[in-house]
Protein backbone atom coordinates (compact mmCIF):
# COMPACT_ATOMS: atom_id res chain seq x y z
CA UNK A 1 0.00 0.00 0.00
CA UNK A 2 1.02 3.59 -0.51
CA UNK A 3 2.82 5.12 2.47
CA UNK A 4 0.61 7.34 4.63
CA UNK A 5 1.08 11.03 3.95
CA UNK A 6 2.41 10.60 0.42
CA UNK A 7 0.66 12.33 -2.45
CA UNK A 8 -1.70 10.10 -4.47
CA UNK A 9 -0.54 9.11 -7.92
CA UNK A 10 -1.51 11.40 -10.75
CA UNK A 11 -4.27 10.45 -13.15
CA UNK A 12 -3.27 7.61 -15.47
CA UNK A 13 -0.80 6.19 -12.96
CA UNK A 14 -0.97 3.84 -10.00
CA UNK A 15 1.14 3.07 -6.95
CA UNK A 16 3.62 0.19 -7.13
CA UNK A 17 4.75 -1.28 -3.82
CA UNK A 18 7.23 -3.41 -5.78
CA UNK A 19 8.92 -0.29 -7.14
CA UNK A 20 7.96 2.12 -4.35
CA UNK A 21 6.73 4.75 -6.79
CA UNK A 22 3.84 5.73 -9.00
CA UNK A 23 3.82 3.96 -12.35
CA UNK A 24 2.28 5.00 -15.64
CA UNK A 25 -0.64 2.68 -16.38
CA UNK A 26 0.58 2.46 -19.98
CA UNK A 27 3.33 0.21 -18.64
CA UNK A 28 0.73 -2.47 -18.01
CA UNK A 29 0.93 -3.22 -21.73
CA UNK A 30 4.45 -4.56 -21.17
CA UNK A 31 3.68 -6.57 -18.06
CA UNK A 32 0.00 -6.88 -17.22
CA UNK A 33 0.66 -8.73 -13.95
CA UNK A 34 2.68 -5.87 -12.42
CA UNK A 35 1.34 -5.02 -8.98
CA UNK A 36 0.25 -1.49 -9.94
CA UNK A 37 -1.90 -2.73 -12.83
CA UNK A 38 -4.62 -3.75 -10.40
CA UNK A 39 -4.96 -0.09 -9.47
CA UNK A 40 -5.05 0.89 -13.12
CA UNK A 41 -7.85 -1.57 -13.88
CA UNK A 42 -9.82 -0.38 -10.86
CA UNK A 43 -9.33 3.32 -11.60
CA UNK A 44 -12.60 5.00 -12.46
CA UNK A 45 -12.91 7.05 -15.65
CA UNK A 46 -12.13 10.75 -15.51
CA UNK A 47 -14.55 12.51 -13.12
CA UNK A 48 -17.31 14.39 -14.89
CA UNK A 49 -17.72 18.12 -14.23
CA UNK A 50 -20.79 18.98 -12.15
CA UNK A 51 -23.12 21.37 -13.92
CA UNK A 52 -24.53 22.74 -10.68
CA UNK A 53 -22.95 23.87 -7.43
Amino acid sequence: EQAPGTAPCSRGSSWSADLDKCMDCASCRARPHSDFCLGCAAAPPAPFRLLWP
Partner: antibody, heavy 120, light 112 residues
Protein backbone atom coordinates in the same frame (compact mmCIF):
# COMPACT_ATOMS: atom_id res chain seq x y z
CA UNK B 1 24.95 0.00 -23.29
CA UNK B 2 23.10 -2.37 -21.00
CA UNK B 3 25.29 -5.17 -19.66
CA UNK B 4 24.82 -7.93 -17.11
CA UNK B 5 28.08 -9.59 -16.10
CA UNK B 6 27.87 -12.73 -13.98
CA UNK B 7 30.42 -14.29 -11.66
CA UNK B 8 32.56 -17.23 -12.77
CA UNK B 9 31.94 -20.96 -12.70
CA UNK B 10 31.71 -22.71 -9.33
CA UNK B 11 32.29 -26.29 -8.20
CA UNK B 12 30.62 -27.20 -4.92
CA UNK B 13 30.15 -30.27 -2.75
CA UNK B 14 26.67 -31.64 -2.02
CA UNK B 15 25.10 -29.87 0.96
CA UNK B 16 27.10 -26.67 0.41
CA UNK B 17 25.77 -23.27 -0.71
CA UNK B 18 26.77 -21.04 -3.59
CA UNK B 19 26.18 -17.35 -4.27
CA UNK B 20 26.12 -16.18 -7.89
CA UNK B 21 26.41 -12.48 -8.71
CA UNK B 22 25.09 -10.41 -11.60
CA UNK B 23 26.56 -6.92 -12.00
CA UNK B 24 24.43 -4.51 -14.01
CA UNK B 25 25.61 -1.44 -15.91
CA UNK B 26 24.31 0.95 -18.54
CA UNK B 27 20.94 1.67 -16.92
CA UNK B 28 19.30 2.63 -13.62
CA UNK B 29 19.54 -0.58 -11.61
CA UNK B 30 16.50 0.11 -9.43
CA UNK B 31 14.15 0.68 -12.37
CA UNK B 32 14.06 -2.86 -13.72
CA UNK B 33 13.46 -6.39 -12.52
CA UNK B 34 16.25 -8.94 -12.35
CA UNK B 35 15.04 -12.48 -13.01
CA UNK B 36 17.01 -15.69 -12.58
CA UNK B 37 16.68 -18.68 -14.91
CA UNK B 38 18.08 -22.21 -14.60
CA UNK B 39 19.26 -24.34 -17.51
CA UNK B 40 20.26 -27.87 -16.53
CA UNK B 41 22.68 -29.66 -18.90
CA UNK B 42 20.96 -30.30 -22.24
CA UNK B 43 17.67 -29.01 -20.84
CA UNK B 44 15.38 -26.05 -21.33
CA UNK B 45 14.86 -22.80 -19.43
CA UNK B 46 13.26 -22.69 -15.99
CA UNK B 47 12.32 -19.49 -14.15
CA UNK B 48 13.58 -19.43 -10.56
CA UNK B 49 12.32 -16.06 -9.41
CA UNK B 50 12.87 -12.33 -9.68
CA UNK B 51 13.69 -9.31 -7.58
CA UNK B 52 12.87 -5.62 -7.67
CA UNK B 53 16.28 -4.24 -6.70
CA UNK B 54 15.01 -0.89 -5.38
CA UNK B 55 12.74 -2.41 -2.77
CA UNK B 56 14.14 -5.93 -2.45
CA UNK B 57 10.71 -7.40 -3.10
CA UNK B 58 10.94 -10.93 -4.49
CA UNK B 59 8.80 -13.47 -6.30
CA UNK B 60 9.77 -17.14 -6.46
CA UNK B 61 8.72 -20.20 -8.39
CA UNK B 62 7.18 -22.66 -5.93
CA UNK B 63 9.80 -25.20 -6.98
CA UNK B 64 12.67 -22.94 -5.88
CA UNK B 65 11.18 -21.47 -2.73
CA UNK B 66 13.56 -22.42 0.06
CA UNK B 67 16.27 -23.39 -2.43
CA UNK B 68 17.07 -19.97 -3.89
CA UNK B 69 17.39 -16.62 -2.13
CA UNK B 70 17.49 -13.47 -4.24
CA UNK B 71 19.04 -10.23 -3.00
CA UNK B 72 20.35 -7.01 -4.51
CA UNK B 73 22.91 -4.39 -3.54
CA UNK B 74 21.94 -1.04 -5.01
CA UNK B 75 25.27 0.55 -4.04
CA UNK B 76 27.11 -1.73 -6.48
CA UNK B 77 24.22 -2.42 -8.91
CA UNK B 78 24.64 -6.12 -8.28
CA UNK B 79 22.00 -8.83 -7.92
CA UNK B 80 22.73 -12.09 -6.14
CA UNK B 81 21.23 -15.55 -6.10
CA UNK B 82 22.18 -17.93 -3.31
CA UNK B 83 21.41 -21.63 -3.67
CA UNK B 84 21.45 -23.70 -0.49
CA UNK B 85 21.70 -27.41 0.34
CA UNK B 86 23.15 -28.17 -3.07
CA UNK B 87 22.43 -31.52 -4.72
CA UNK B 88 23.55 -33.01 -8.02
CA UNK B 89 20.32 -31.87 -9.70
CA UNK B 90 21.31 -28.25 -9.00
CA UNK B 91 24.15 -28.62 -11.51
CA UNK B 92 23.20 -26.13 -14.22
CA UNK B 93 23.96 -22.87 -15.93
CA UNK B 94 22.20 -20.02 -14.14
CA UNK B 95 21.31 -16.84 -16.02
CA UNK B 96 20.27 -13.46 -14.74
CA UNK B 97 18.07 -11.37 -17.01
CA UNK B 98 16.84 -7.80 -16.88
CA UNK B 99 13.12 -7.66 -17.53
CA UNK B 100 11.32 -4.50 -18.43
CA UNK B 101 8.10 -3.24 -16.91
CA UNK B 102 7.79 -0.22 -19.17
CA UNK B 103 5.45 0.28 -22.12
CA UNK B 104 5.19 -2.25 -24.94
CA UNK B 105 8.67 -3.59 -25.43
CA UNK B 106 9.86 -6.45 -23.30
CA UNK B 107 13.53 -5.87 -24.18
CA UNK B 108 15.22 -8.52 -22.11
CA UNK B 109 18.96 -8.42 -21.53
CA UNK B 110 20.68 -11.56 -20.29
CA UNK B 111 23.91 -12.26 -18.45
CA UNK B 112 26.41 -14.69 -19.94
CA UNK B 113 25.46 -17.44 -17.50
CA UNK B 114 27.26 -19.05 -14.56
CA UNK B 115 27.91 -22.78 -14.49
CA UNK B 116 27.42 -24.32 -11.05
CA UNK B 117 28.65 -27.90 -10.75
CA UNK B 118 27.70 -29.96 -7.72
CA UNK B 119 29.97 -32.95 -7.30
CA UNK B 120 31.44 -34.93 -4.46
CA UNK C 1 0.89 -22.44 -14.08
CA UNK C 2 0.70 -21.93 -17.83
CA UNK C 3 2.24 -24.86 -19.70
CA UNK C 4 3.94 -24.08 -23.02
CA UNK C 5 4.25 -26.94 -25.53
CA UNK C 6 6.39 -26.69 -28.67
CA UNK C 7 6.55 -28.79 -31.82
CA UNK C 8 8.59 -30.13 -33.39
CA UNK C 9 11.37 -30.59 -30.82
CA UNK C 10 13.92 -31.02 -33.62
CA UNK C 11 13.84 -29.32 -36.99
CA UNK C 12 16.43 -30.05 -39.69
CA UNK C 13 16.39 -27.19 -42.21
CA UNK C 14 17.88 -26.35 -45.59
CA UNK C 15 19.42 -22.88 -46.00
CA UNK C 16 17.20 -20.68 -48.14
CA UNK C 17 14.09 -22.71 -47.35
CA UNK C 18 11.29 -21.64 -44.97
CA UNK C 19 10.85 -23.09 -41.49
CA UNK C 20 8.05 -23.02 -38.97
CA UNK C 21 7.79 -23.77 -35.23
CA UNK C 22 4.54 -24.17 -33.31
CA UNK C 23 3.81 -23.31 -29.70
CA UNK C 24 0.65 -24.05 -27.74
CA UNK C 25 -0.23 -22.62 -24.32
CA UNK C 26 -2.43 -24.38 -21.77
CA UNK C 27 -4.52 -21.23 -21.39
CA UNK C 28 -5.20 -18.22 -23.53
CA UNK C 29 -2.43 -15.61 -23.65
CA UNK C 30 -4.83 -13.03 -25.08
CA UNK C 31 -5.30 -10.32 -22.45
CA UNK C 32 -8.40 -8.15 -22.24
CA UNK C 33 -6.24 -5.30 -23.60
CA UNK C 34 -6.02 -7.15 -26.94
CA UNK C 35 -2.38 -8.20 -26.60
CA UNK C 36 -1.16 -11.79 -26.88
CA UNK C 37 1.64 -12.18 -24.33
CA UNK C 38 3.66 -14.71 -26.30
CA UNK C 39 7.42 -14.33 -26.79
CA UNK C 40 10.05 -16.15 -28.85
CA UNK C 41 13.69 -16.52 -27.86
CA UNK C 42 16.66 -17.99 -29.69
CA UNK C 43 19.56 -19.54 -27.82
CA UNK C 44 22.50 -19.96 -30.16
CA UNK C 45 25.09 -22.62 -29.25
CA UNK C 46 27.11 -21.54 -26.22
CA UNK C 47 25.22 -18.27 -25.82
CA UNK C 48 22.52 -16.73 -23.66
CA UNK C 49 18.95 -16.60 -24.96
CA UNK C 50 18.07 -13.54 -27.04
CA UNK C 51 14.63 -12.08 -27.59
CA UNK C 52 13.33 -12.43 -31.16
CA UNK C 53 9.62 -11.66 -30.97
CA UNK C 54 7.59 -9.97 -28.25
CA UNK C 55 3.83 -9.82 -27.82
CA UNK C 56 3.34 -12.50 -30.47
CA UNK C 57 4.21 -10.53 -33.59
CA UNK C 58 6.63 -7.68 -32.82
CA UNK C 59 10.27 -8.14 -33.81
CA UNK C 60 12.79 -7.12 -31.18
CA UNK C 61 15.40 -4.53 -32.07
CA UNK C 62 17.93 -5.81 -34.61
CA UNK C 63 15.99 -8.96 -35.49
CA UNK C 64 15.93 -9.60 -39.27
CA UNK C 65 12.56 -9.37 -41.00
CA UNK C 66 12.79 -13.00 -42.13
CA UNK C 67 11.48 -13.81 -38.63
CA UNK C 68 7.76 -13.38 -38.03
CA UNK C 69 5.31 -14.40 -35.33
CA UNK C 70 1.59 -15.04 -35.58
CA UNK C 71 -1.32 -16.79 -33.86
CA UNK C 72 -3.84 -15.95 -31.19
CA UNK C 73 -5.12 -17.22 -27.87
CA UNK C 74 -3.42 -20.57 -27.38
CA UNK C 75 -1.82 -21.40 -30.75
CA UNK C 76 1.22 -19.58 -32.07
CA UNK C 77 3.74 -19.91 -34.86
CA UNK C 78 7.23 -18.62 -35.49
CA UNK C 79 8.16 -18.51 -39.17
CA UNK C 80 11.56 -18.05 -40.77
CA UNK C 81 10.98 -17.11 -44.39
CA UNK C 82 14.44 -18.16 -45.59
CA UNK C 83 16.68 -19.96 -43.12
CA UNK C 84 20.29 -18.83 -42.87
CA UNK C 85 23.19 -20.73 -41.31
CA UNK C 86 23.30 -18.25 -38.41
CA UNK C 87 19.73 -19.18 -37.42
CA UNK C 88 20.75 -22.51 -35.90
CA UNK C 89 20.12 -22.97 -32.20
CA UNK C 90 17.27 -23.72 -29.83
CA UNK C 91 14.08 -21.67 -30.13
CA UNK C 92 11.90 -21.21 -27.06
CA UNK C 93 8.42 -19.79 -26.75
CA UNK C 94 7.45 -18.20 -23.44
CA UNK C 95 4.60 -16.18 -22.01
CA UNK C 96 4.52 -12.98 -20.00
CA UNK C 97 0.90 -13.00 -18.91
CA UNK C 98 1.48 -13.84 -15.26
CA UNK C 99 3.96 -15.42 -12.88
CA UNK C 100 5.52 -17.93 -13.05
CA UNK C 101 7.30 -17.12 -16.29
CA UNK C 102 7.29 -20.41 -18.22
CA UNK C 103 8.99 -21.59 -21.39
CA UNK C 104 8.38 -24.26 -23.99
CA UNK C 105 10.70 -27.26 -24.10
CA UNK C 106 12.63 -25.76 -26.99
CA UNK C 107 12.96 -26.59 -30.69
CA UNK C 108 16.45 -27.40 -31.93
CA UNK C 109 16.99 -26.04 -35.43
CA UNK C 110 19.95 -27.47 -37.28
CA UNK C 111 21.17 -27.42 -40.86
CA UNK C 112 20.50 -30.63 -42.82
Amino acid sequence: QVQLVQSGAEVKKPGASVKVSCKASGYTFTDFIIAWVKQAPGQGLEWIGEIYPGTGRTYYSEKFRGKATLTADTSTSTAYMELSSLRSEDTAVYFCARRTIYYDYDGDYWGQGTLVTVSS
Amino acid sequence: DIVMTQSPLSLPVTPGEPASISCRSSQSLLHSNGINYLYWYLQKPGQSPQLLIYQMSNRASGVPDRFSGSGSGTDFTLKISRVEAEDVGVYYCAHNLELPWTFGQGTKVEIK
